[in-house]
């Protein structure tokens, strides 16, 4: 349902995708129970949500991971929601951190991030984690989205 | 405040209710500081939020639980946000998992789930957990809601 | 972008600020990548978001903290989202609890709270924690905001 041609609803919800890439940027796909309202928001290269219109957006990500204290670095597992705007430095919008579990072989934990941010036309948001190999890709565990206010 | 008769605000926020039922589906009530905007969203049988209008909804749940690794099964505590639509499979929309704490008698942890989904008229959303007896029902700890974009 | 003069967008996102105060109420600032849509929502005394218009709001907070089981009280770390309305008792809207980590010197954990609530003109929301000294103020770790539906 549209708010009107001038002010259509803009929303996206994408699903995590396991990746063989060694990058810390999580990969996403339009599969399963995803949402992509229209072409005013797009998933680019499977890694970032890019918006065409300026405005305030509620942006969120959920990451479930499985890690073990002994098998991981001493540093906690950190998930970061980041912003890339044309001609600007990349910015960290939100971060969450969870210390690794002592459970074996690994202990699952879930992180949720969300906040309201002003995005410029062409701005992209993406999610970084300290160790993508620890992320859980089972149904519903890891997802990423936004909605325009 | 209404957006207009054709496009009223639709939102709900309900509060967890302890239940003697052995079902894994959490029970909710319109009590305390709850929200129920109008009859376009209803709480049915104390267990599911049902919407009358098709559209994009941001749906969320928060579950606080108290568990102990030794007293619980090896499997983590999992909270699932699920969708029931007429004539369709029930669907897992979102899940979060937390490994049980080693704290005694139990260690509290909180899970937050949220995402944007398209709902059909008559669709219902509900929350499943692996062990409802571990859920914390103190003021503000466990809640469930949605808002129509 | 405005919905119209009669119905402007109202949203805020503020950033945590370390404080020498011994109060359990977290302090916030309009700094970094913050949002303050207009004067219909304001940050008062660095501690509460106050709204001028009645209506339904999605209110959220994220708190990252670092604690150790041995160095902390036995009680878990609790974050509370609270409401203060003119001439009414303060109310707890949402709470989340996490048991302290056994990691040394401390283990980081993140809490996310969010829900839809009716606010009256002049209502304020604020965030309480059991031990503000444990809160992490690094970029993006701890934030607080709202948006009017």
């Amino acid at each position: 349902m549209q708010k009107g041609d001038q002010n259509p609803q803009i929303a996206a919800h994408v699903i995590s995708e396991a990746s063989s890439k060694t990058t810390s940027v999580l990969q996403w796909a339009e599969k399963g129970y995803y949402t992509m309202s229209n072409n005013l928001v797009t998933l680019e290269n499977g890694k970032q949500l890019t918006v065409k219109r300026q405005g305030l957006y509620y942006i969120y990500a959920q990451v479930t991971f499985c890690s073990n204290r002994e098998a991981s670095s001493q540093a906690p597992f950190i998930a970061s929601l980041c912003l890339k705007s044309p001609g600007r430095f990349e910015r960290i919008l939100l971060r969450a951190a969870n210390t690794h579990s002592s459970a074996k072989p690994c202990g699952q934990q879930s992180i949720h991030l969300g906040g309201v941010f002003e995005l410029q036309p062409g701005a992209s948001v993406f999610v970084n984690v300290t160790d993508p190999s620890q992320v859980s890709h089972g149904t519903g565990f890891t997802s990423f989205g936004l909605l325009k206010l | 405040m209404q957006k207009g008769d054709q496009n009223p605000q639709i939102a709900a926020h309900v509060i967890s209710e302890a239940s003697s039922k052995t079902t894994s589906v959490l029970q909710w009530a319109e009590k305390g500081y709850y929200t129920m905007s109008n009859n376009l969203v209803t709480l049915e049988n104390g267990k599911q939020l049902t919407v009358k209008r098709q559209g994009l909804y941001y749906i969320y749940a928060q579950v606080t639980f108290c568990s102990n690794r030794e007293a619980s099964s090896q499997a983590p505590f999992i909270a699932s946000l699920c969708l029931k639509s007429p004539g369709r499979f029930e669907r897992i929309l979102l899940r979060a998992a937390n490994t049980h704490s080693s704290a005694k008698p139990c260690g509290q942890q909180s899970i937050h789930l949220g995402g944007v989904f398209e709902l059909q008229p008559g669709a219902s959303v509900f929350v499943n957990v692996t062990d409802p007896s571990q859920v914390s029902h103190g003021t503000g700890f466990t809640s469930f809601g949605l808002l129509k974009l | 972008m405005q919905k119209g003069d009669q119905n402007p967008q109202i949203a805020a996102h503020v950033i945590s600020e370390a404080s020498s105060k011994t109060t359990s109420v977290l302090q916030w600032a309009e700094k970094g990548y913050y949002t303050m849509s207009n004067n219909l929502v304001t940050l008062e005394n660095g501690k509460q978001l106050t709204v001028k218009r009645q209506g339904l709001y999605y209110i959220y907070a994220q708190v990252t903290f670092c604690s150790n089981r041995e160095a902390s009280s036995q009680a878990p770390f609790i974050a509370s989202l609270c409401l203060k309305s003119p001439g009414r008792f303060e109310r707890i809207l949402l709470r989340a609890a996490n048991t302290h980590s056994s990691a040394k010197p401390c283990g980081q954990q993140s809490i996310h709270l969010g829900g839809v609530f009716e606010l009256q003109p002049g209502a304020s929301v604020f965030v309480n924690v059991t031990d503000p000294s444990q809160v992490s103020h690094g970029t993006g770790f701890t934030s607080f905001g709202l948006l009017k539906l």
């Epitope: 995803y34 890709h137 089972g138 | 989904f117 | -």
Partner: nanobody, 123 residues
Framework: EVQLVESGGGLVQPGGSLRLSCAAS????????MGWFRQAPGKEREFIAV????????LYADSVKGRFTISADNSKNTAYLQMNSLKPEDTAVYYC????????????????WGQGTLVTVSS
């Protein structure tokens, strides 16, 4: 498109058990979830159980929780419904269905359906 063939239906006494099978062929790489519905005479088709192909997660209708178990053998491209403690009210035609990937929440994806298998619970 996915082709589905059910088997295992029949007549069983109250309290008895049956195991239904649903063999999939065709575009099996595009299966997101497989599950079961049933339709009793004069009633609407009713959801029973679903299993996610990706990780084996499952959901059940309240009416069968604790009595029915859905499972899948990916190597055989087959889903199963183990039905225990059967009751007369479980009598119906049981249909297997497959939901394809790419069926976003903004789309009502078309399911692929089997032809159905009759289960009769009677003494």
């Amino acid at each position: 498109e996915v082709q589905l063939v059910e088997s295992g239906g029949g007549l069983v006494q109250p309290g008895g058990s049956l195991r239904l099978s649903c063999a999939a062929s065709g575009s099996i790489d595009n299966i997101h979830a497989m599950g079961w519905f049933r339709q009793a005479p004069g009633k609407e088709r009713e959801f029973i159980a679903v299993i996610y192909w990706r990780d084996g997660s499952s959901l059940y209708a309240d009416s069968v929780k604790g009595r029915f178990t859905i499972s899948a053998d990916n190597s055989k491209n087959t889903a199963y419904l183990q039905m225990n403690s059967l009751k007369p009210e479980d009598t119906a035609v049981y249909y297997c269905a497959a939901e394809p990937y790419g069926s976003g929440s903004s789309l009502i994806s078309e399911y692929d359906w089997g032809q159905g298998t009759l289960v009769t619970v009677s003494s």
